[in-house]
């Protein structure tokens, strides 16, 4: 197995996932494509935790670029050992992966809390509140209750879809970073096995 190539694959995957997380989080600010709810502060409190922008997004780009950089050929040796520099880099990637685990973990936790609490919406009695908070997430299984939210239009579907996407993306990021921790430890201990002649496609 080539640890550098594996890291590069993980890095590229994380860049895509991070960009999707940022996009999903941004969409949460514009239910039904309207800006008024953000300006009136009629959005779920968990939207303001920036879990997709920061946790699953920007914080994920740091380890992603570290992992991509591991595959570069200009990694210098040390102490007369060609692979020593690459081994050090692989081990240092573990630290970057741990940052990724923290970011994706934050994204997953906030998305799960956002799903459990439900959206802030104008209910059928004209109250802006967390209409489904008291149902402890049971509203997710009982779609007939979603009509209790009258504004923003389709807010329950919007929130459930986007927080579910953030939950899934954050979960995948978490798993990939976990794989890179194992990959980095193995690559650092076992040595950098790829010769310059070997070519692998991700």
């Amino acid at each position: 197995m080539c640890y550098g190539k594996c890291a590069r694959c993980i890095g590229h995957s994380l860049v895509g996932l991070a960009l999707l997380c940022i996009a999903a989080n941004i969409l949460l600010y514009f239910p039904n494509g309207e800006t008024k709810y953000a300006s009136e502060n009629h959005l779920s409190r968990f939207v303001w935790f920036f879990s997709g922008i920061v946790g699953g997004g920007l914080l994920m780009l740091l380890p992603a670029f570290v992992f991509i950089g591991l595959e570069q050929d200009d990694c210098c040796g040390c102490c007369g050992h060609e692979n020593c520099g690459k081994r050090c880099a692989m081990l240092s990637s573990v630290l970057a992966a741990l940052i990724g685990i923290a970011g994706s973990g934050y994204c997953v936790i906030v998305a799960a809390l956002g799903l459990a609490e439900g959206p802030l919406c104008l209910d059928s009695l004209g109250q802006w509140n967390y209409t489904f908070a008291s149902t402890e997430g049971q509203y997710l299984l009982d779609t007939s209750t979603w009509s209790e939210c009258t504004e923003p239009k389709h807010i329950v579907e919007w929130n459930v879809s986007l927080f579910s996407i953030l939950l899934a993306l954050g979960g995948i990021e978490f798993i990939l970073c976990l794989i890179q921790v194992i990959n980095g430890v193995l690559g650092g201990i076992c040595g950098f096995c790829c010769s310059h002649q070997q070519q692998y496609d991700c």
Partner: antibody
Framework: EVQLQQSGPELVKPGASVKLSCKAS????????MHWVKQKPGQGLEWIGY????????NCNEKFKGKATLTSDKTSSTAYMELSSLTSEDSAVYYC?????????WGQGTLVTVSA | DIQMTQSPASLSASVGEPVTITCRAS??????LAWYHQKQGKSPQFLVY???TLAGGVPSRLSGSGSVTQFSLNINTLHREDLGTYFC?????????FGGGTNLEIK
């Protein structure tokens, strides 16, 4: 002070349609929900449906689907309910009620009498 | 549809007495319950929502309680203006059905 002014009593023939109006005045908020409720003489209350005039989200009791159509005009702050294919069973007082911010305001009711 | 059952159907009490009206839902409605008061020939008045929150302008002698399927409206000191019919209504999922009503008379 918020007031809901409903249109006057209606005497209609079976099979005909009638459009009831409910004009809201004194509102300081844009977001509110307008409900319609039916009450037959000396009986209980029956929820017909609601409309959010801002988002145009409507929800109607299945029992009244095909019978009641809820609409609203934001510019005149008026909600409408059209009742079609009227029968004697539709003879009742129809109330509009507006909910917002922990308050509910009810119109005075419109008496609809279906008679040949 | 969720069925709302009120009891008693009618009751008579003296001014100054405490009164309790109960409402039972046919399934769990959490705290999605409202109470209304209607006097003869008048429009209903909104009293309580979310089972225990008093609507604006409602006197504090009234209080709502309960959750899941069992709810009650309490009047701790009955006043003359409290006579009329009381209705409960759930607002958990549509249709938002009302209870049959409790007619309160003053002795």
């Amino acid at each position: 002070e918020v007031q809901l002014q409903q249109s006057g009593p209606e005497l209609v023939k079976p099979g005909a349609s009638v459009k009831l109006s409910c004009k809201a005045s004194g509102y300081t908020v844009t977001s509110y929900v307008m409900h319609w409720v039916k009450q037959k003489p000396g009986q209980g209350l029956e929820w017909i449906g609601y409309i959010n005039p801002y988002s145009d989200v409507t929800n109607c009791n299945e029992k009244f689907k095909g019978k009641a159509t809820l609409t609203s005009d934001k510019t005149s702050s008026t909600a409408y309910m059209e009742l079609s294919s009227l029968t004697s069973e539709d003879s009742a007082v129809y109330y509009c009620s507006s909910y917002g911010g922990g308050f509910a305001y009810w119109g005075q009711g419109t008496l609809v009498t279906v008679s040949a | 549809d969720i069925q709302m059952t009120q009891s008693p159907a009618s009751l008579s009490a003296s001014v100054g007495e405490p009164v309790t009206i109960t409402c039972r839902a046919s399934k769990n409605i959490y705290t999605y319950l409202a109470w209304y008061h209607q006097k003869q020939g008048k429009s209903p008045q909104f009293l309580v929502y979310n089972a225990r929150t008093l609507a604006g302008g409602v006197p504090s002698r009234l209080s709502g309680s309960g959750s899941v399927t069992q709810f009650s409206l309490n009047i701790n000191t009955l006043h003359r203006e409290d006579l009329g019919t009381y209705f409960c209504q759930h607002h958990y999922d549509t249709p938002y059905t009302f209870g049959g009503g409790t007619n309160l008379e003053i002795k």
